[in-house]
């Protein structure tokens, strides 16, 4: 778990206890079973605007 008192990870990243830092969720493409990827799955990407009405 993230150490108390530390800032939460920015959007699109998740805390890794294995690495002791926030990790970019894009890194889950290289290694989907990394510990931080669970947090990435739980946090959906930023909402996007539909390209049609």
């Amino acid at each position: 778990e993230q150490a108390p008192g530390t800032a939460p990870c920015s959007r699109g990243s998740s805390w890794s206890a294995d690495l002791d830092k926030c990790m970019d969720c894009a890194s889950c493409r290289a290694r989907p079973h990394s510990d931080f990827c669970l947090g990435c799955a739980a946090a959906p990407p930023a909402p996007f605007r539909l390209l049609w009405p």
Epitope: A17, L19, D20, M23, R29, A30, P32
Partner: antibody, heavy 120, light 112 residues
């Protein structure tokens, strides 16, 4: 360039322990996983476990839990594997390998292997 | 654990011709992201394994484009379009979907 330099061959007696090393260079040691893989003569590749050098957190194959102990020394950029209660079935070549965590997949890098012979 | 299965030997091939090596996984390696976590390694005699292919179809750095790979979620084929003498060795498939990291038993490429 990325290099993993493993320690030399070991000849040890049954029941003893051995500690082999894997010295990393050419990259930031704490940013990548070091995995250890066993290969008996003429046989395939068997994952033993892996370590995150920055935190020391480890993951082991159930088969090697209690047999192998993985550690890392950040000051010397060196990963270690200790094998205990050795028997003839532990005689093998042991490889260390750098595994990526990051989006830019740049492949795995392997050490040259350490040959362990367990014999009385 | 995911079991990776390979034939121990390939059909003997002639230099300059093509060769195919197969691999099967006990579980689909196709992730919800659309990536298939299948990897191919070559271990030449007396050497360490070297990565050839990652994520089923991507050529690793420095690997000649004579090598290619394709497959479904569980059945995979490595193809060498024009076999050279330096291609001789044992080819291993492996996955990177989860732990433990497991390898196939290896397929030895033999020349006629």
């Amino acid at each position: 360039q990325v290099q993993l330099q493993q320690s030399g061959p070991e000849l040890v007696k049954p029941g003893a322990s051995v500690k082999m090393s894997c010295k990393a260079s050419g990259y930031t040691f704490t940013d990548f996983i070091i995995a250890w893989v066993k290969q008996r003569t003429g046989q395939g590749l068997e994952w033993i476990g892996e370590i995150y050098p920055g935190t020391g957190r480890t993951y082991y194959s159930e088969k090697f839990r209690g047999k192998a102990t993985l550690t890392a020394d950040k000051s010397s950029n060196t990963a270690y594997m200790q094998l205990s209660s050795l028997t003839s079935v532990d005689s093998a070549v042991y490889f260390c390998a750098r595994r990526t965590i990051y989006y830019d997949y740049d492949g795995d890098y392997w050490g040259q292997g350490t040959t362990l012979t367990v014999s009385s | 654990d995911i079991v990776m299965t390979q034939a121990a030997f390939s059909n003997p091939v002639t230099l300059g011709t093509s060769a195919s090596i197969s691999c099967r996984s006990s579980k689909s390696l196709l992730h919800s992201s659309g990536i298939t976590y299948l990897y191919w390694y070559l271990q030449k005699p007396g050497q360490s394994p070297q990565l050839l292919i990652y994520q089923m179809s991507n050529l690793a750095s420095g690997v000649p484009d004579r090598f290619s790979s394709s497959g479904s979620g569980t059945d995979f084929t490595l193809r060498i379009s024009r076999v050279e003498a330096e291609d001789v060795g044992v080819y291993y498939c492996a996955h990177n979907l989860e732990l433990p990291w497991t390898f196939g038993g290896g397929t030895k490429l033999e020349l006629k």
